[in-house]
């Protein structure tokens, strides 16, 4: 939802969290603002305090319940408002009717680990976190490997078009330090976006055996 120079963007993690970012040009830095969530079908509502993340943007997380509880469904619509204090009153700065399963961003994958490493290849696995059982296999992943002397932005993206929580990296250089990241996205939702990248997993390929042609 956009009001003039105001932008209000929220995503549902598919379980019990709605994360929101509100940006407003010329907004007062010392104003107290919050996001208020009012579902159309539920008897709970939730508020979080917007905290500055840059000169003109604020963010907060609406914690709807226990991390793995399924607090919203595809039928729910949540009215989300940005409220800022003006004296003794609260002023509505932005508002949107939020459809959770059209605006998904899952948590970053966790528990990355090296399953097996060789001189030229490495098998890595991970787990998804706080993802609705609704998705079943309807997820896709992107992965990237950081090679020495390169940046993450330069790393080619590897796409896994199915729910596959492992990857075998090939054509690696022996005895070399690498880092690996993965992210996940449900196939559902018009405004759904990729999760944040996972924490990088550092690993080192095995050295080539002496006297062997590599």
């Amino acid at each position: 939802a956009v009001n003039g120079t105001s932008q209000f963007t929220c995503f549902y993690n598919s379980r019990a969290n709605i994360s929101c970012v509100w940006s407003q040009d010329g907004a007062l830095q010392d104003t107290s603002c919050q996001v208020h969530a009012w579902p159309d079908r539920r008897r709970w509502n939730q508020t979080c305090e917007l905290l500055p993340v840059s000169q003109a943007s604020w963010a907060c997380n609406l914690i709807l319940g226990a991390p793995d509880s399924q607090k919203l469904t595809t039928v729910d619509i949540v009215t989300l408002r940005v409220l800022c204090r003006e004296g003794v009153r609260w002023r509505v700065m932005a508002i949107q009717d939020f459809k959770p399963f059209e605006n998904l961003r899952l948590m970053a994958p966790i528990s990355l680990q090296v399953v097996h490493v060789e001189t030229h290849r490495c098998n890595i696995s991970w787990e998804i976190s706080q993802a609705s059982h609704y998705f079943e296999r309807h997820l896709e992943f992107e992965a990237r490997t950081l090679s020495p002397g390169h940046t993450w932005e330069e790393a080619p993206l590897l796409t896994l078009k199915q729910k596959q929580e492992w990857i075998c990296l090939e054509t690696l250089t022996p005895d070399t330090q690498y880092e690996f990241q993965v992210r996940v996205k449900p196939l559902q939702g018009e405004f759904t976006t990729w999760s944040p990248w996972s924490q990088p997993l550092a690993f080192r390929t095995k050295p080539a055996a002496l006297g062997k042609d590599t």
Partner: antibody, heavy 120, light 106 residues
Framework: EVQLVESGGGLVQPGGSLRLSCAAS????????MSWVRQAPGKGLEWIGE????????NYAPSLKDRFTISRDNAKNSLYLQMNSLRAEDTAVYYC?????????????WGQGTTVTVSS | DIQMTQSPSSLSASVGDRVTITCSAS?????MHWYQQKPGKAPKRWIY???KLASGVPSRFSGSGSGTEFTLTISSLQPEDFATYYC?????????FGGGTKVEIK
Amino acid sequence: EVQLVESGGGLVQPGGSLRLSCAASGFDFSRYWMSWVRQAPGKGLEWIGEINPDSSTINYAPSLKDRFTISRDNAKNSLYLQMNSLRAEDTAVYYCARHDYDEGIYFDYWGQGTTVTVSS
Amino acid sequence: DIQMTQSPSSLSASVGDRVTITCSASSRVIYMHWYQQKPGKAPKRWIYDTSKLASGVPSRFSGSGSGTEFTLTISSLQPEDFATYYCQQWSSNPPTFGGGTKVEIK
């Protein structure tokens, strides 16, 4: 104790109209979504439609929305179903049901039902 | 609309038997709910959110499943369990019910 009591059923000719009522007690009616559900003789359950607490949102089964209208009066703790252009296939027991939500959405209380017979 | 297919449509079983009723959805659903209905009576909420027993429902009942396949299980059938059981989804509008499974005495 939560109670839902339907009334207004009866025998009506094809093409006729009928208005069903559901009287609610034992809970704060004005806070709950409500639905109508019907069951034809010997058949399964069919959702008719729902209404939110302040009547600002009313949804219907696509096949019924042109002939059926749901309304409510929170001051009277009452839910209504106006049925027009009735057909023989509308013969059924009509239930009102209260919605509840834990994580999913379901019906936690049902009325005893009122029978509508459409026949000439 | 999401179509719900219950199987079997009816079954005959003896007291003490283990009974399993299956509900298949034509598309993925987040939760399945189950209702018990006895002749001439209104349905009663029986199992909600796939596996949670409604108040007063005996622990011999259980629910499970995800995606498109869900089950209601009675571990040891008792005389008061003879009834018709309906599954219901509300993961997308409109909510839909299965055709019902009638549990009869053998």
